[in-house]
């Protein structure tokens, strides 16, 4: 996989008025890396590994960049004409990548109320607009504003591309990202399924990098794909990943099954625990009312395009 740096910024308007704050997250190699702390008005590393990337250097440069980008995005939102009453969001995602062959890619994407309406390849400066009439209108709005804005000249896009790559290379130079390996914690649980059956779930958490093999074996042989359910490999918010695999087995046959895990050249096998059946339940909280800008920002988070 290529090394990547991804900026994710969101600004909001309420009843046509652009709000003063902004949301910003930066992902390095797919991991939450930086976040803009609205209370302290500073870029903050996400976890110890992110702090290790810069070592004893300050995060002033990152704070300055994110603040500038947030300001630009607020101005862009202010120029979107069709803002009706209520809550609206403008999100910008900028990504740059360095591939194994040293080739690079950079792109920028704009979303309004969670819907993509404008993309740009920052190397070729080619713009792409989805077919929908709403997207076409929004794109025209934003492109006109960007053209008017003297800052958004041809050289500006080259600079955006170059700056992103420069930052990515700077982070990679620390070596922390390249050499980091965090082995997974593996946990096997069982839960009641139907009469005579139990569901066994194998969870791997807190691992890095994201590539992992997690599979159920019966008598040492991997079960076929269609008898297993896999969860996505997802960031867990600590600079590491998590995933799971589950299968249904006959009660009394637990001894035949093991969860096999392989990660970064290491492997392990994990038996099904015997004894009491644990019933696992998920509790989801639903928020219907939001009060104040902070709540709006928090609510907005779940709308993000990851």
């Amino acid at each position: 996989e290529p090394h990547s740096l991804r900026y994710n910024l969101t600004v909001l308007s309420w009843d046509g008025s652009v709000q003063s704050g902004f949301l910003a997250e930066v992902h390095l190699d797919g991991q939450p890396f930086l976040r803009y702390d609205r209370q302290k008005c500073r870029a903050k590393p996400q976890g110890q590994w992110a702090e290790d990337v810069l070592g004893n250097k300050t995060w002033d440069r990152e704070t300055r960049d994110l603040t500038g980008n947030g300001k630009d995005l607020r101005m862009t939102l202010a120029h979107i004409k069709d803002q009706k009453e209520g809550l609206h969001s403008l999100q910008e995602i900028r990504v740059c990548e360095i591939h194994e062959d040293n080739s690079t890619r950079s792109s920028q994407h704009f979303y309004y109320d969670g819907e993509l309406f404008l993309s740009q390849n920052l190397e070729t400066e080619e713009w792409t607009v989805p077919q929908s009439s709403r997207a076409q209108t929004l794109a025209m709005n934003v492109r006109n504003f960007l053209k008017e804005d003297a800052m958004k000249t041809k050289t500006h896009y080259h600079a955006m591309h170059a700056d992103c790559l420069q930052e990515l290379r700077r982070y990679l130079e620390s070596g922390v990202v390249l050499r980091r390996t965090v082995p997974p914690m593996v946990n096997v649980t069982r839960s009641e399924a139907s009469e005579g059956n139990i569901t066994v779930t194998c969870r791997a958490s807190s691992f890095y990098p994201r590539n992992i093999i997690l599979t159920w074996r019966q008598d040492g042989v991997s079960l076929s794909h269609d008898t297993q359910q896999w969860g996505d490999v997802l960031p867990d918010g600590n600079g590491t990943y998590q995933t799971w695999v589950a299968t249904r087995i006959c009660r009394g046959e637990e001894q035949r099954f093991t969860c096999y895990m392989e990660h970064s050249g290491n492997h392990s096998t994990h038996p099904v625990p015997s004894g009491k059946v644990l019933v696992l339940q998920s509790h989801w909280q639903h928020h219907h009312h939001h009060h104040g800008l902070n709540d709006i920002f928090e609510a907005q988070k779940i709308e993000w395009h990851e």
Partner: antibody
Framework: EVQLQQSGPELVKPGASVKVSCKAS????????IYWVKQSHGKSLEWIGY????????VQNQKFKGKATLTVDKSSSTAYMHLNSLTSEDSAVYYC???????????WGQGTLVTVSS | DIQMTQTTSSLSASLGDRVTISCRAS??????LNWYQQKPDGTVKLLIY???RLHSGVPSRFSGSGSGTDYSLTISNLEQEDIATYFC?????????FGSGTKLEIK
């Protein structure tokens, strides 16, 4: 290339015990189970049990519980089967086998002949 | 325990022949059926797993088929090196059990 090298033939007295070894090479030993199979003279094959070299967990054929004990030494990538209280019924060729994770008994050792005789 | 029956204990065929060896399980084994070849020197090799999947390195003249309780191994073009005893084995239910073997000889 996956190889399972078994220990040489054994001639033992009734009532004694014997330890058959199976040294694995050509793959990561703790990745795959080791299975043990018995073949009495001129007869079919019987599955004895298997061991997971990673954690030492075993699953055995009820018929061989109390007769066979399966162990591993991870440091030397060697699996062992200890047979106790031997009788003439235990005279047989004993095979170890391993898997590639997709099929049972994928690779076999050359077999160890155990002869129980006074 | 599941009984695996190979009714033909020995079989004579000529080189180039198509040979089929049968195996029956005492109950449905859901295609968890493997075939092994044991040479006269005692060497054992996996040929076919999960009824019809050819193990890597095994010549394509070997094939397997079947379902439920009835399974078979076919050698499409018998060669001298195929002289051996063939065992079926079920992997569906513990304990794993083997057929009694079919010894293949040249006419």
């Amino acid at each position: 290339e996956v190889q399972l090298q078994q220990s040489g033939p054994e001639l033992v007295k009734p009532g004694a015990s014997v330890k058959v070894s199976c040294k694995a090479s050509g793959y990561a030993f703790t990745k795959y189970n080791i299975y043990w199979v018995k073949q009495s003279h001129g007869k079919s094959l019987e599955w004895i049990g298997y061991i997971d070299p990673y954690n030492g967990g075993t699953v055995q054929n009820q018929k061989f519980k109390g007769k066979a004990t399966l162990t591993v030494d991870k440091s030397s990538s060697t699996a062992y089967m200890h047979l106790n209280s031997l009788t003439s019924e235990d005279s047989a060729v004993y095979y170890c086998a391993t898997t590639d994770g997709y099929s049972l008994f994928t690779y076999w050792g050359q077999g160890t002949l155990v002869t129980v005789s006074s | 325990d599941i009984q695996m029956t190979q009714t033909t204990s020995s079989l004579s065929a000529s080189l180039g022949d198509r040979v089929t060896i049968s195996c029956r399980a005492s109950q449905d084994i859901g295609n968890y059926l493997n075939w092994y070849q044991q040479k006269p020197d005692g060497t054992v090799k996996l040929l076919i797993y999960y009824t019809s999947r050819l193990h890597s390195g095994v010549p394509s003249r070997f094939s397997g088929s079947g379902s439920g309780t009835d399974y078979s191994l076919t050698i499409s073009n018998l060669e001298q090196e195929d002289i051996a005893t063939y065992f079926c084995q079920q992997g569906n239910t513990l304990p794993f059990t083997f057929g009694s073997g079919t010894k293949l000889e040249i006419k």
